[in-house]
Every structure is written in C-alpha cells, then in structure tokens.
C-alpha cells in the first residue's frame, strides 16, 4: 500500500482502468466514464475568480507520475490526487485546496490515495 507522500514509479497495468470524469471527459467517454492505461485523478483548483473547481478524469501512464505530483505553481492554488486500485476509484478522492501560507515550499508529495491494498500483478 502506498501512503500519502510516498513516491512511486508508475507501472504498466495489465488491463484498462475506468475512471469517473467531470469537466475533463475525452471524446470517447460514455456516461462520464473514461478509460486509461494509467491513473484516475481528482483535482481541485481555483478558477480566475477564486472559486474552487473540482475536475476528475483519466491520466495516461506516460507522464502521470509528474502530473500526480502536487508541485506548487506560483499564484495558483491546486491539489490533485491519483489512484489505480479499482475502477472509478477517483469517486472517493477528495483533495482540498492547500492553505495559502503553505505555498512557498518547492516540492510537493505525490498524492496516491489508496483506500484498499493495491496488489501488483506480474
């Protein structure tokens, strides 16, 4: 099991993963479900007016390790959590906006929320 903050290299899944998508659904999605070889994610960020907006969807394996890393962006409050342990696992992800005073650190943790053990199949 990967705990919050523990770094993990993405590994190829043996099969496709279905994720819930909201505000981030690709053309091929049906009933707000997308498919990926990588991760499901849920993200919260502030829009231009400062209103929190939640989006969710699929991240391809390639580049997802970077994307799932909560690297601070100057003048932008954002938090992302990723998961792979079951289909639509991102329904249970609830990232929160970081407090403003914490936005001066350089490297954030990778947020892999696993509510169940993630068995790696070989």
């Amino acid at each position: 099991k990967k705990e919050d903050g523990e770094s993990t290299a993405p590994t190829a899944r043996p099969k496709v993963l279905r994720c819930k998508c909201h505000h981030h659904c690709p053309e091929d999605s049906v009933n707000n479900i997308c498919s990926t070889d990588g991760y499901c994610f849920t993200m919260i960020e502030e829009d231009d007016s400062g209103t929190p907006v939640v989006t969710s969807g699929c991240l391809g394996l390639e580049g997802s390790d970077f994307q799932c890393r909560d690297t601070p962006i100057p003048h932008q409050r954002r938090s992302i959590e990723c998961c792979t342990e079951r289909n639509e696992c991102n329904k249970d992800l609830h990232p929160t906006l970081p407090p403003l005073k914490d936005r001066d650190f350089v490297d954030g943790p990778i947020h892999h929320k696993h509510h169940h053990h993630h068995h790696h199949h070989h």
Epitope: P14, K15, V16, P26, D28, S29, V30, I33, S35, E88
Partner: antibody, heavy 117, light 113 residues
Amino acid sequence: QVQLQQPGAELVMPGASVKLSCKASGYTFTNYWMHWVKQRPGQGLEWIGEIDPSDVYTTYNQKFKDKATLTVDKSSSTAYMQLINLTSEDSAVYYCARSGWDYFDYWGQGTALTVSS
Amino acid sequence: DIVMTQSPSSLAMSVGQKVTMSCKSSQSLLKSNNQKNYLAWYQQKPGQSPKLLVYFASTRESGVPDRFIGSGSGTDFTLTISSVQAEDLADYFCQQYYSTPWTFGGGTKLEIK
C-alpha cells in the same frame, strides 16, 4: 495456455432464466476483463457487457441492461451471465471473451442457448 | 453507438489470390492522445469461436500468419490477405473499442473457389 470453458448447450423454456458459465484457466483471472458476446445464427456479433473480476465493476450495453446480469466467482475463476425472461429472440450462441485493452484476445467455445417449449 | 459497416458481405477467391475487405466506422476511431486507432479484426471459421487477428488497426496478434495485414485510420480500415490459403475460409469481423458499447461489423464471408 489460456482457456475459457463454456458448456456446449442449454435448453430452457420461454419466460425462464438461465445462468451461463465461463471457467477461466491458464492466466490470473483478476488481471483481465471478461466480456459476453451474443451471436444469432447467420448473424453478426453483439457485445452484451463486461466485468472486471478484481472489483466486480460492470459495464452493460444498454440494449441488454434489463436482460443480462454479469457476476464472477473469484475462488473458482468463473464468470457468469444470467439471462432473464427468456424469449425466442434470446436463442443464440453466447461467448465469453477475455480482454486487457478492450479487444478480445481469447474467446470461449460458446454456449448454444435454445429457448423453446 | 458507433456503427461498423463491412463490405463486401461475401467474396469468393482462389488460393494464392490477394483479398481485401473493408470496414468503415460512423465516427473516427483515432484517439488523439496516443494516435492509435481502436479497431480490431477477428476471424471466425465455421463452427468455431472468433479468433483475434489484428488490434490497433494494424498490429498483428502473436501467432497470426503475416499474410494478414491490417491498415487504415480514422473511419476507413482494410484487412488484406496477401495470398489466400484454403484454411482462410471464414467470416471476418471488425470491432471498434473506441467507445462503449463496443460494436462489430456485420462480417465478410470469404469463400474459396
């Protein structure tokens, strides 16, 4: 080697239900999706639905959502499809098929379902 | 639902001839994020279950003879048998796995003269 074993035939009465089985062997059952496909005599192939044995997540073709229910028994590596309120239109060969990435790399031999009184 | 249309519905060829069959989809099967076409081809011999020949439009499944060649992109796809053999007598189906429900073409029946 990968095998998906299905009974050769089933004969059931109109209005009844039937539970078709598909026993998987030669691979890790939870590592792949299982699909069910219908083929009527001399006709094409229709996808009924899919189930991920690892978390029992299912997706159905809307056409079959009130007709078919997909389940698995992980302990015996067996997938099941229950069909209800059977009519002559349900007479067909039903295949189970395995997928990793939504194309079907192994198929069972099919169960010929006959609905007749 | 994506509609898959195959043509011709049947054809008769002599051993050694080149065979081409077409599969057209009602919308593009090309995913922009990875530039792959989500289309597969299957062979179904009489009395048997379907067998995977090609996936991602042009990737031959392991163990499939190299005379089977898949090509095409977007909405137009072709399965070519470069030199047909007697054992290729079968129905051939295309399938899209771009968007659920996964759908199949009506098939092309290949007969050997």
